[in-house]
Interface confidence: medium
């Protein structure tokens, strides 16, 4: 079953807001003047990271020697992070004695850069997407997904890891961003808000969507994630916004119906294989792309983000199930598990379609402020 589509011909923001056309250029604040993040109404603005030491690139990540075994993502400084996990934060938590097991918490101190210096990098994720400022790149071809329609067996591991719900994917799910840019899917997870509060990580014109799915991929140039961390294009994430629609989404229901089983932090269950591509929008040709980072520590940069223009529709009940079932650290609900949007710092978001073209009658000429940087790729 294909997923319901948002308005096919309007860039993101138009379909979700009910408007027939996207915002005109005159409605946009300049990048320099805009706040670091546009929070949904009622959400406290978070302290900025502008005064933190910038970090252009993540230091090279080298595996441990063979004698020591491979590098683990959890080999990060030990920190204590009390605080209210109900508020979205750029902060993390790592249990003091949890040698190789780390637990990220949204909320509390210290700032993430103290946990992983890369979190203070200049090219972080998520970001606010402004279609009018995106560079149209005809070289960005439709995404290619192979092997995403999984049989029921073997079953897949669905886990509440304390900061999201994560589905571990088996080998064989291949994705290509373009010729020679081939990846293997590793896992998918979701970000969400709370009752009446949206929780997507990326925003569009400052608009936050109810939720967001991330499918994390490893470049075929690398054998292991630790080798790819911080390397340009080492990891790629497909991201799609989840919105409220009139009907139940049967693909998502296969996962959402199992959340009660993993309500506790650290719990997991096995779910039959499913069509992973059915969790994504059906239009693989229209998307935004930029280079950013992981949105949780270690915040490694060099991650290629592909954010679909089309959204995925879930019923109101399904969105409520997602945001109101799971529990995180410290007997707190697992909610609002998104990072604040990060400054672009000169990055240009590219679009595979003319997202900056205003189709409304008042636009005499297409507006396209940035040129494509990847035309020759």
């Amino acid at each position: 079953q294909r997923l319901p589509r948002m308005q096919e011909d309007s860039p993101l923001g138009g379909g979700s807001s009910g408007e027939d056309d996207p915002l005109g250029e005159e409605d946009l604040p300049s990048e320099e003047d805009s706040p670091r993040e546009e929070d949904p109404p009622g959400e406290e603005d978070l302290p900025g990271e502008e005064d933190l030491p910038g970090e252009e690139d993540l230091p090279e990540v080298k595996p441990k020697s063979e004698e020591e075994g491979s590098l683990k993502l959890e080999d990060l400084p030990t920190v204590e992070a009390p605080g209210d996990p109900q508020e979205p934060q750029n902060n993390a938590h790592r249990d003091k004695e949890g040698d190789d097991q780390s637990h990220w918490r949204y909320g509390g101190d210290p700032p993430w850069p103290r946990v992983s210096p890369a979190c203070a990098g200049r090219f972080q994720s998520p970001v606010d997407i402004r279609p009018q400022l995106a560079a149209f790149c005809p070289a960005l071809r439709p995404l290619e997904l192979l092997g995403f329609q999984l049989p029921p067996l073997p079953e897949l591991r669905l886990r509440n890891n304390g900061h999201s719900v994560q589905l571990t994917l088996p080998p064989g799910l291949e994705m290509a961003l373009g010729p020679g840019r081939e990846y293997r899917a590793l896992q998918l997870h979701l970000h969400w808000g709370a009752a009446g509060r949206p929780g997507s990580e990326h925003t569009v014109e400052g608009h936050r969507f109810p939720a967001e799915i991330h499918v994390v991929h490893l470049s075929t140039a690398f054998a292991r994630v630790d080798e790819a961390l911080g390397r340009p294009g080492g990891l790629a994430v497909l991201a799609a916004f989840l919105e409220e629609g009139p009907e139940e989404n049967s693909a998502y229901e296969q996962l959402l119906s199992r959340l009660e089983e993993i309500a506790e932090e650290g719990s997991e269950t096995q779910v039959p294989g499913l069509d992973i591509s059915a969790l994504l929008p059906s239009d693989f040709s229209r998307y935004f792309q930029y280079e950013g980072s992981l949105t949780t520590p270690p915040c490694a940069q060099g991650v290629i983000w592909t954010v679909f223009n089309q959204t995925v529709m879930l019923s109101a009940k399904q969105l409520h199930t997602l945001s109101d079932t799971l529990w995180g650290p410290g007997d707190s609900r697992l909610q609002l598990n998104f990072r604040a949007t990060q400054p672009l710092n000169g990055r240009v978001i590219e679009a595979s379609f003319p997202a900056g073209v205003d189709s409304s009658p008042r636009a005499a000429e297409p507006v396209q402020l940035n040129s494509c940087l990847a035309a020759g790729d």
Partner: antibody
Framework: QVQLQESGPGLVKPSETLSLTCTVS????????WSWIRQPPGKGLEWIGY???????NYNPSLKSRVTISVDTSKNQFSLKLSSVTAADTAVYYC??????????????????WGQGTTVTVSS | DIQMTQSPSSVSASVGDRVTITCRAS??????LAWYQQKPGKAPKLLIY???SLQSGVPSRFSGSGSGTDFTLTISSLQPEDFATYYC?????????FGPGTKVDIK
């Protein structure tokens, strides 16, 4: 350095409940999975089940109806109860730390720390 | 349940020999496989995790390979302290299951 120590009676009567405790020293029980494994005399290893520090459990279906694993984080201990035992439950019982990554991608690091094992004989 | 089989069930070898033990899963388990060494009267010891990653403190003569259903543990040059029983274990699906073991003894 994390160490595990099993404790409990070495002899249990048939139809009774076997109770064992594993004490974690040199580190915290938090943020890990903790497994029980057994090994009948002269045979291989059988996973009984595990518990996460938050209290969530997963059991071997072959033993699920008889097994309860619990955790006491304040004492840095986790426990095994196996009800309605028979002679087939005679084995060396081990506790172990089981490392499943809870980072942004799944990774399995194996059972890296084991107790020395305790022999439990089921006999009248 | 995923069944794990090992071959050979036992192997006689001499110090300095190269020893290879294979483990096969009844269905694909990605790379979620660990290898353990157990000596009589002792608890198992983790050697390899994630199919090919060497556990800290384990000599580099031990190596693991494989993915999917077929895996191999290799001891490049057998040492006197390596005579033991070796078990593989999968962590792809519940219940976690072990292979029946391979006993490496002195020829």
């Amino acid at each position: 350095q994390v160490q595990l120590q099993e404790s409990g009676p070495g002899l249990v009567k048939p139809s009774e409940t076997l109770s064992l405790t594993c004490t974690v020293s040199g580190g915290s029980i938090s943020s890990y999975y903790w497994s029980w494994i057994r090994q009948p005399p002269g045979k291989g290893l059988e996973w009984i089940g595990y518990i996460y520090s938050s209290g969530s459990t997963n059991y071997n279906p072959s033993l699920k109806s008889r097994v309860t694993i619990s955790v006491d984080t304040s004492k840095n201990q986790f426990s095994l109860k196996l009800s309605s035992v028979t002679a087939a439950d005679t084995a060396v019982y081990y506790c172990a730390r089981d490392q499943h990554s809870s980072s942004f991608y799944y990774y399995y690091y194996g059972m890296d720390v084991w107790g020395q094992g305790t022999t439990v004989t089921v006999s009248s | 349940d995923i069944q794990m089989t090992q071959s050979p069930s036992s192997v006689s070898a001499s110090v300095g020999d190269r020893v290879t033990i294979t483990c096969r899963a009844s269905q694909g388990i990605s790379s979620w496989l660990a290898w353990y060494q157990q000596k009589p009267g002792k608890a198992p010891k983790l050697l390899i995790y994630a199919a090919s990653s060497l556990q800290s403190g384990v000599p580099s003569r031990f190596s693991g390979s494989g993915s999917g259903t077929d895996f191999t543990l290799t001891i490049s040059s057998l040492q006197p302290e390596d005579f033991a029983t070796y078990y593989c274990q999968q962590a792809n699906s519940f219940p976690l299951t072990f292979g029946p073991g391979t006993k490496v003894d002195i020829k």
